[in-house]
Protein backbone atom coordinates (compact mmCIF):
# COMPACT_ATOMS: atom_id res chain seq x y z
CA UNK A 1 0.00 0.00 0.00
CA UNK A 2 2.80 2.38 0.95
CA UNK A 3 4.59 1.52 -2.29
CA UNK A 4 1.49 2.32 -4.36
CA UNK A 5 1.01 5.61 -2.49
CA UNK A 6 4.67 6.57 -2.95
CA UNK A 7 4.52 5.72 -6.65
CA UNK A 8 1.23 7.54 -7.17
CA UNK A 9 2.39 10.62 -5.28
CA UNK A 10 5.68 10.60 -7.20
CA UNK A 11 3.74 10.51 -10.46
CA UNK A 12 1.43 13.40 -9.46
CA UNK A 13 4.31 15.55 -8.15
CA UNK A 14 6.30 14.94 -11.35
CA UNK A 15 3.25 15.71 -13.48
CA UNK A 16 2.81 19.08 -11.73
CA UNK A 17 6.56 19.72 -12.05
CA UNK A 18 6.67 19.01 -15.78
CA UNK A 19 3.57 21.17 -16.36
CA UNK A 20 5.47 23.92 -14.52
CA UNK A 21 8.59 23.44 -16.66
CA UNK A 22 6.47 23.73 -19.83
CA UNK A 23 4.77 26.85 -18.43
CA UNK A 24 8.10 28.45 -17.48
CA UNK A 25 9.59 27.74 -20.91
CA UNK A 26 6.64 29.40 -22.65
CA UNK A 27 6.43 32.40 -20.31
CA UNK A 28 7.62 35.81 -21.50
CA UNK A 29 8.70 37.07 -18.09
CA UNK A 30 12.13 35.51 -17.73
CA UNK A 31 13.65 38.93 -17.16
CA UNK A 32 11.60 41.97 -16.21
CA UNK A 33 12.50 45.63 -16.10
CA UNK A 34 13.65 46.64 -12.65
CA UNK A 35 11.47 49.60 -11.73
CA UNK A 36 13.52 50.42 -8.64
CA UNK A 37 15.23 53.81 -9.06
CA UNK A 38 14.19 53.90 -12.74
CA UNK A 39 12.93 57.25 -14.01
CA UNK A 40 11.32 55.77 -17.13
CA UNK A 41 7.97 54.42 -15.99
CA UNK A 42 6.12 55.09 -19.26
CA UNK A 43 7.03 51.63 -20.52
CA UNK A 44 7.60 48.28 -18.85
CA UNK A 45 9.83 45.82 -20.67
CA UNK A 46 10.06 42.09 -20.14
CA UNK A 47 11.91 39.41 -22.05
CA UNK A 48 11.46 35.68 -22.49
CA UNK A 49 13.29 32.85 -24.22
CA UNK A 50 11.33 33.29 -27.44
CA UNK A 51 10.17 36.91 -27.57
CA UNK A 52 10.33 40.27 -25.83
CA UNK A 53 7.44 42.49 -24.82
CA UNK A 54 6.72 46.13 -24.03
CA UNK A 55 3.76 47.27 -21.96
CA UNK A 56 3.08 50.97 -22.35
CA UNK A 57 1.36 53.25 -19.84
CA UNK A 58 -1.70 53.29 -22.13
CA UNK A 59 -2.11 49.58 -21.37
CA UNK A 60 -1.07 48.52 -24.87
CA UNK A 61 1.25 45.51 -24.83
CA UNK A 62 3.34 44.55 -27.83
CA UNK A 63 5.32 41.34 -28.09
CA UNK A 64 7.64 40.31 -30.89
CA UNK A 65 9.63 37.12 -31.41
CA UNK A 66 13.38 36.95 -31.85
CA UNK A 67 13.23 36.15 -35.55
CA UNK A 68 16.99 35.76 -35.75
CA UNK A 69 19.84 33.94 -34.08
CA UNK A 70 22.19 36.82 -34.83
CA UNK A 71 22.71 39.13 -31.90
CA UNK A 72 21.20 36.68 -29.41
CA UNK A 73 23.46 35.56 -26.55
CA UNK A 74 24.88 32.04 -26.93
CA UNK A 75 23.73 31.35 -23.37
CA UNK A 76 20.13 31.87 -24.47
CA UNK A 77 20.50 28.96 -26.90
CA UNK A 78 21.91 26.81 -24.11
CA UNK A 79 18.99 27.68 -21.81
CA UNK A 80 16.47 26.92 -24.57
CA UNK A 81 18.15 23.55 -25.17
CA UNK A 82 18.19 22.63 -21.45
CA UNK A 83 14.51 23.50 -21.03
CA UNK A 84 13.46 21.57 -24.15
CA UNK A 85 15.52 18.51 -23.12
CA UNK A 86 13.88 18.73 -19.69
CA UNK A 87 10.39 18.82 -21.23
CA UNK A 88 11.09 15.94 -23.63
CA UNK A 89 12.60 13.71 -20.93
CA UNK A 90 9.78 14.59 -18.55
CA UNK A 91 7.12 13.79 -21.15
CA UNK A 92 8.70 10.40 -21.93
CA UNK A 93 9.02 9.77 -18.19
CA UNK A 94 5.31 10.49 -17.71
CA UNK A 95 4.38 8.11 -20.52
CA UNK A 96 6.54 5.33 -19.07
CA UNK A 97 5.32 5.94 -15.51
CA UNK A 98 1.63 5.69 -16.50
CA UNK A 99 2.21 2.06 -17.57
CA UNK A 100 4.37 1.46 -14.48
CA UNK A 101 1.67 2.52 -11.99
CA UNK A 102 0.76 -0.36 -9.66
CA UNK A 103 -2.88 0.63 -9.68
CA UNK A 104 -3.11 0.18 -13.46
CA UNK A 105 -3.24 -3.38 -14.81
CA UNK A 106 -1.99 -3.93 -18.35
CA UNK A 107 -2.28 -7.54 -19.44
CA UNK A 108 -0.15 -9.83 -17.30
CA UNK A 109 2.73 -7.40 -16.70
CA UNK A 110 5.16 -8.77 -14.13
CA UNK A 111 5.99 -6.75 -11.01
CA UNK A 112 9.64 -6.81 -12.04
CA UNK A 113 8.75 -5.09 -15.33
CA UNK A 114 6.74 -2.47 -13.46
CA UNK A 115 9.65 -1.95 -11.08
CA UNK A 116 12.04 -1.42 -14.00
CA UNK A 117 9.66 1.01 -15.66
CA UNK A 118 9.19 2.90 -12.39
CA UNK A 119 12.96 3.20 -11.98
CA UNK A 120 13.36 4.34 -15.61
CA UNK A 121 10.69 7.01 -15.26
CA UNK A 122 12.15 8.08 -11.90
CA UNK A 123 15.59 8.59 -13.43
CA UNK A 124 14.02 10.50 -16.34
CA UNK A 125 12.18 12.79 -13.92
CA UNK A 126 15.37 13.43 -11.95
CA UNK A 127 17.32 14.34 -15.12
CA UNK A 128 14.37 16.45 -16.37
CA UNK A 129 14.23 18.37 -13.08
CA UNK A 130 17.99 18.90 -13.11
CA UNK A 131 17.83 20.21 -16.71
CA UNK A 132 15.15 22.74 -15.75
CA UNK A 133 17.00 23.88 -12.63
CA UNK A 134 20.24 24.15 -14.62
CA UNK A 135 18.54 26.11 -17.43
CA UNK A 136 16.93 28.60 -15.07
CA UNK A 137 20.13 28.96 -13.04
CA UNK A 138 22.25 29.58 -16.16
CA UNK A 139 19.79 32.29 -17.23
CA UNK A 140 19.80 33.90 -13.77
CA UNK A 141 23.60 33.86 -13.75
CA UNK A 142 23.65 35.47 -17.24
CA UNK A 143 21.37 38.29 -16.01
CA UNK A 144 23.56 39.03 -13.00
CA UNK A 145 26.86 38.74 -14.90
CA UNK A 146 25.66 40.97 -17.74
CA UNK A 147 24.39 43.55 -15.28
CA UNK A 148 27.73 43.89 -13.52
CA UNK A 149 29.65 43.93 -16.82
CA UNK A 150 27.39 46.65 -18.24
CA UNK A 151 27.71 48.68 -15.04
CA UNK A 152 31.50 48.39 -15.17
CA UNK A 153 31.54 49.44 -18.84
CA UNK A 154 29.44 52.52 -18.09
CA UNK A 155 31.76 53.69 -15.35
CA UNK A 156 34.97 52.99 -17.28
CA UNK A 157 33.68 54.90 -20.29
CA UNK A 158 33.47 51.83 -22.53
CA UNK A 159 29.74 52.29 -22.97
CA UNK A 160 30.25 55.02 -25.56
CA UNK A 161 27.59 57.73 -25.59
CA UNK A 162 25.55 58.63 -22.55
CA UNK A 163 22.64 56.21 -22.78
CA UNK A 164 19.20 57.36 -23.77
CA UNK A 165 17.57 55.13 -21.16
CA UNK A 166 19.27 53.08 -18.51
CA UNK A 167 17.14 49.97 -18.07
CA UNK A 168 18.18 47.09 -15.92
CA UNK A 169 16.52 43.69 -15.87
CA UNK A 170 15.86 41.55 -12.83
CA UNK A 171 14.57 38.00 -12.28
CA UNK A 172 11.14 37.44 -13.81
CA UNK A 173 8.33 35.18 -12.63
CA UNK A 174 9.36 32.42 -15.06
CA UNK A 175 12.63 31.89 -13.18
CA UNK A 176 10.81 31.16 -9.92
CA UNK A 177 8.26 28.95 -11.68
CA UNK A 178 11.15 27.07 -13.31
CA UNK A 179 13.06 26.56 -10.06
CA UNK A 180 9.99 25.28 -8.21
CA UNK A 181 8.86 23.11 -11.13
CA UNK A 182 12.34 21.62 -11.53
CA UNK A 183 12.46 20.88 -7.81
CA UNK A 184 9.06 19.18 -7.89
CA UNK A 185 10.04 17.05 -10.88
CA UNK A 186 13.24 16.08 -9.07
CA UNK A 187 11.36 15.14 -5.88
CA UNK A 188 8.81 13.17 -7.93
CA UNK A 189 11.64 11.27 -9.61
CA UNK A 190 13.24 10.41 -6.26
CA UNK A 191 9.86 9.15 -5.00
CA UNK A 192 9.49 6.95 -8.09
CA UNK A 193 12.95 5.49 -7.49
CA UNK A 194 12.05 4.78 -3.84
CA UNK A 195 8.78 3.15 -4.96
CA UNK A 196 10.75 0.98 -7.39
CA UNK A 197 12.58 -0.65 -4.48
CA UNK A 198 9.28 -1.67 -2.93
CA UNK A 199 7.93 -3.01 -6.22
CA UNK A 200 10.96 -5.14 -7.08
CA UNK A 201 10.48 -8.79 -6.11
CA UNK A 202 13.10 -10.10 -3.65
CA UNK A 203 15.73 -12.33 -5.21
CA UNK A 204 16.41 -14.20 -1.99
CA UNK A 205 14.07 -16.96 -0.76
CA UNK A 206 14.03 -15.83 2.85
CA UNK A 207 10.25 -15.41 2.96
CA UNK A 208 8.27 -17.17 5.65
CA UNK A 209 7.76 -20.70 4.36
CA UNK A 210 4.99 -23.13 5.24
CA UNK A 211 6.27 -26.72 5.23
CA UNK A 212 3.76 -29.53 5.02
CA UNK A 213 3.81 -33.27 4.94
CA UNK A 214 1.72 -35.39 2.66
CA UNK A 215 -0.79 -36.36 5.38
CA UNK A 216 -3.24 -34.39 7.51
CA UNK A 217 -0.48 -33.23 9.78
CA UNK A 218 -0.05 -29.75 11.13
CA UNK A 219 2.68 -27.54 9.69
CA UNK A 220 4.44 -24.82 11.65
CA UNK A 221 4.73 -21.36 10.19
CA UNK A 222 7.85 -19.59 11.49
CA UNK A 223 7.27 -16.12 12.81
CA UNK A 224 3.51 -16.62 13.28
CA UNK A 225 1.26 -17.91 16.04
CA UNK A 226 -1.18 -19.69 13.81
CA UNK A 227 -0.73 -23.18 12.49
CA UNK A 228 -2.23 -24.23 9.21
CA UNK A 229 -2.80 -27.39 7.28
CA UNK A 230 -0.99 -28.24 4.15
CA UNK A 231 -4.26 -27.92 2.26
CA UNK A 232 -5.04 -24.94 0.13
CA UNK A 233 -5.60 -24.32 -3.52
CA UNK A 234 -2.58 -23.17 -5.49
CA UNK A 235 -4.49 -20.27 -7.00
CA UNK A 236 -1.50 -18.96 -8.92
CA UNK A 237 -1.12 -22.35 -10.60
CA UNK A 238 2.60 -22.36 -9.99
CA UNK A 239 4.76 -25.43 -9.71
CA UNK A 240 5.74 -25.99 -6.11
CA UNK A 241 9.41 -26.74 -5.51
CA UNK A 242 11.49 -27.60 -2.43
CA UNK A 243 9.68 -30.78 -1.58
CA UNK A 244 6.32 -29.18 -1.06
CA UNK A 245 7.53 -25.98 0.61
CA UNK A 246 5.39 -22.97 -0.26
CA UNK A 247 5.92 -19.30 0.35
CA UNK A 248 3.15 -17.35 2.00
CA UNK A 249 2.47 -15.66 -1.30
CA UNK A 250 1.96 -18.94 -3.08
CA UNK A 251 -0.50 -20.61 -0.74
CA UNK A 252 -3.95 -19.41 0.10
CA UNK A 253 -5.24 -21.05 3.32
CA UNK A 254 -8.94 -21.38 4.00
CA UNK A 255 -10.25 -21.96 7.56
CA UNK A 256 -11.04 -25.62 8.23
CA UNK A 257 -11.67 -27.98 11.11
CA UNK A 258 -7.96 -28.81 11.15
CA UNK A 259 -6.93 -25.24 12.01
CA UNK A 260 -5.68 -24.72 15.54
CA UNK A 261 -5.00 -21.35 17.20
Amino acid sequence: MAVTACQGLGFVVSLIGIAGIIAATCMDQWSTQDLYNNPVTAVFNYQGLWRSCVRESSGFTECRGYFTLLGLPAMLQAVRALMIVGIVLGAIGLLVSIFALKCIRIGSMEDSAKANMTLTSGIMFIVSGLCAIAGVSVFANMLVTNFWMSTANMYTGMGGMVQTVQTRYTFGAALFVGWVAGGLTLIGGVMMCIACRGLAPEETNYKAVSYHASGHSVAYKPGGFKASTGFGSNTKNKKIYDGGARTEDEVQSYPSKHDYV
Epitope: L76, M142, S150, T164, Y169
Partner: nanobody, 119 residues
Framework: AVQLVDSGGGLVQAGGSLRLSCAAS????????MAWYRQAPGNQRELVAT???????NYADSVKGRFTISRDNAKNTVYLQMNTLKPEDTAVYYC?????????????WGQGTQVTVSS
Amino acid sequence: AVQLVDSGGGLVQAGGSLRLSCAASPTIFVTDVMAWYRQAPGNQRELVATLLGRSTTNYADSVKGRFTISRDNAKNTVYLQMNTLKPEDTAVYYCNLHRNLFNKIDNYWGQGTQVTVSS
Protein backbone atom coordinates in the same frame (compact mmCIF):
# COMPACT_ATOMS: atom_id res chain seq x y z
CA ALA B 1 25.72 42.66 -34.88
CA VAL B 2 22.99 45.03 -36.04
CA GLN B 3 23.55 47.23 -39.08
CA LEU B 4 21.77 50.59 -39.35
CA VAL B 5 21.47 52.38 -42.68
CA ASP B 6 20.44 56.06 -42.56
CA SER B 7 18.82 57.74 -45.56
CA GLY B 8 16.51 60.61 -46.53
CA GLY B 9 18.82 63.58 -45.94
CA GLY B 10 19.33 66.41 -48.38
CA LEU B 11 19.11 70.11 -49.07
CA VAL B 12 15.82 71.79 -48.17
CA GLN B 13 14.48 75.36 -47.89
CA ALA B 14 13.63 76.78 -44.46
CA GLY B 15 10.06 75.85 -43.57
CA GLY B 16 10.26 72.71 -45.68
CA SER B 17 9.99 69.05 -44.66
CA LEU B 18 12.16 65.92 -44.80
CA ARG B 19 11.65 62.34 -43.71
CA LEU B 20 14.70 60.44 -42.50
CA SER B 21 14.72 56.62 -42.53
CA CYS B 22 16.84 54.16 -40.58
CA ALA B 23 16.70 50.55 -41.76
CA ALA B 24 17.95 47.95 -39.27
CA SER B 25 19.14 44.46 -40.14
CA PRO B 26 18.66 41.72 -39.17
CA THR B 27 15.86 42.88 -36.84
CA ILE B 28 14.60 45.35 -34.25
CA PHE B 29 13.32 43.95 -30.95
CA VAL B 30 10.35 45.66 -29.31
CA THR B 31 12.42 46.41 -26.21
CA ASP B 32 15.06 48.24 -28.27
CA VAL B 33 15.24 52.01 -27.69
CA MET B 34 15.45 53.82 -31.02
CA ALA B 35 16.82 57.36 -31.19
CA TRP B 36 17.96 60.09 -33.56
CA TYR B 37 20.97 62.23 -32.73
CA ARG B 38 22.44 65.13 -34.67
CA GLN B 39 25.83 66.74 -34.85
CA ALA B 40 26.37 70.22 -36.30
CA PRO B 41 29.89 71.27 -37.36
CA GLY B 42 31.99 72.13 -34.30
CA ASN B 43 29.28 70.94 -31.88
CA GLN B 44 28.81 67.83 -29.78
CA ARG B 45 26.38 65.10 -30.81
CA GLU B 46 22.97 65.93 -29.30
CA LEU B 47 19.87 63.83 -28.74
CA VAL B 48 16.94 64.81 -30.96
CA ALA B 49 14.24 62.17 -30.30
CA THR B 50 13.77 58.77 -28.68
CA LEU B 51 11.18 56.04 -29.14
CA LEU B 52 10.40 53.35 -26.60
CA GLY B 53 7.93 50.65 -27.49
CA ARG B 54 5.41 51.64 -30.12
CA SER B 55 4.47 55.18 -29.16
CA THR B 56 6.36 56.35 -26.09
CA THR B 57 8.39 59.28 -27.41
CA ASN B 58 10.66 61.96 -26.06
CA TYR B 59 11.96 65.05 -27.89
CA ALA B 60 14.60 67.73 -27.40
CA ASP B 61 13.02 71.08 -26.54
CA SER B 62 14.33 72.64 -29.77
CA VAL B 63 12.37 70.22 -31.99
CA LYS B 64 9.16 69.65 -29.98
CA GLY B 65 6.05 70.03 -32.11
CA ARG B 66 8.04 69.97 -35.36
CA PHE B 67 9.68 66.52 -35.41
CA THR B 68 7.98 63.10 -35.06
CA ILE B 69 9.74 59.76 -34.48
CA SER B 70 8.00 56.51 -35.43
CA ARG B 71 8.82 52.91 -36.27
CA ASP B 72 7.57 50.20 -38.59
CA ASN B 73 8.38 46.83 -37.02
CA ALA B 74 7.38 44.89 -40.13
CA LYS B 75 10.02 46.77 -42.15
CA ASN B 76 12.51 47.02 -39.25
CA THR B 77 12.68 50.75 -39.94
CA VAL B 78 12.59 53.90 -37.81
CA TYR B 79 11.58 57.27 -39.20
CA LEU B 80 12.10 60.90 -38.26
CA GLN B 81 9.54 63.21 -39.85
CA MET B 82 10.92 66.76 -39.79
CA ASN B 83 8.51 69.64 -40.49
CA THR B 84 8.98 73.42 -40.42
CA LEU B 85 12.74 73.05 -40.74
CA LYS B 86 15.01 75.91 -39.60
CA PRO B 87 18.59 76.75 -40.62
CA GLU B 88 19.75 75.72 -37.12
CA ASP B 89 18.54 72.16 -37.86
CA THR B 90 21.44 71.80 -40.31
CA ALA B 91 23.54 68.85 -39.12
CA VAL B 92 24.49 65.25 -39.76
CA TYR B 93 21.67 63.09 -38.35
CA TYR B 94 22.55 59.70 -36.85
CA CYS B 95 20.21 56.81 -36.08
CA ASN B 96 20.90 54.99 -32.82
CA LEU B 97 19.70 51.62 -31.55
CA HIS B 98 20.14 50.98 -27.83
CA ARG B 99 19.65 47.32 -27.07
CA ASN B 100 19.47 45.82 -23.61
CA LEU B 101 18.96 42.09 -23.98
CA PHE B 102 19.07 40.30 -20.62
CA ASN B 103 21.25 43.13 -19.22
CA LYS B 104 23.70 42.84 -22.11
CA ILE B 105 23.86 46.41 -23.41
CA ASP B 106 24.76 47.20 -27.01
CA ASN B 107 24.73 50.48 -28.91
CA TYR B 108 24.52 50.57 -32.68
CA TRP B 109 24.90 53.63 -34.91
CA GLY B 110 23.99 54.46 -38.47
CA GLN B 111 26.54 56.06 -40.82
CA GLY B 112 24.70 59.39 -40.67
CA THR B 113 22.80 61.42 -43.25
CA GLN B 114 23.41 65.11 -44.00
CA VAL B 115 20.53 67.56 -43.62
CA THR B 116 21.10 71.10 -44.87
CA VAL B 117 18.47 73.80 -44.37
CA SER B 118 19.05 76.94 -46.43
CA SER B 119 17.54 80.28 -45.52
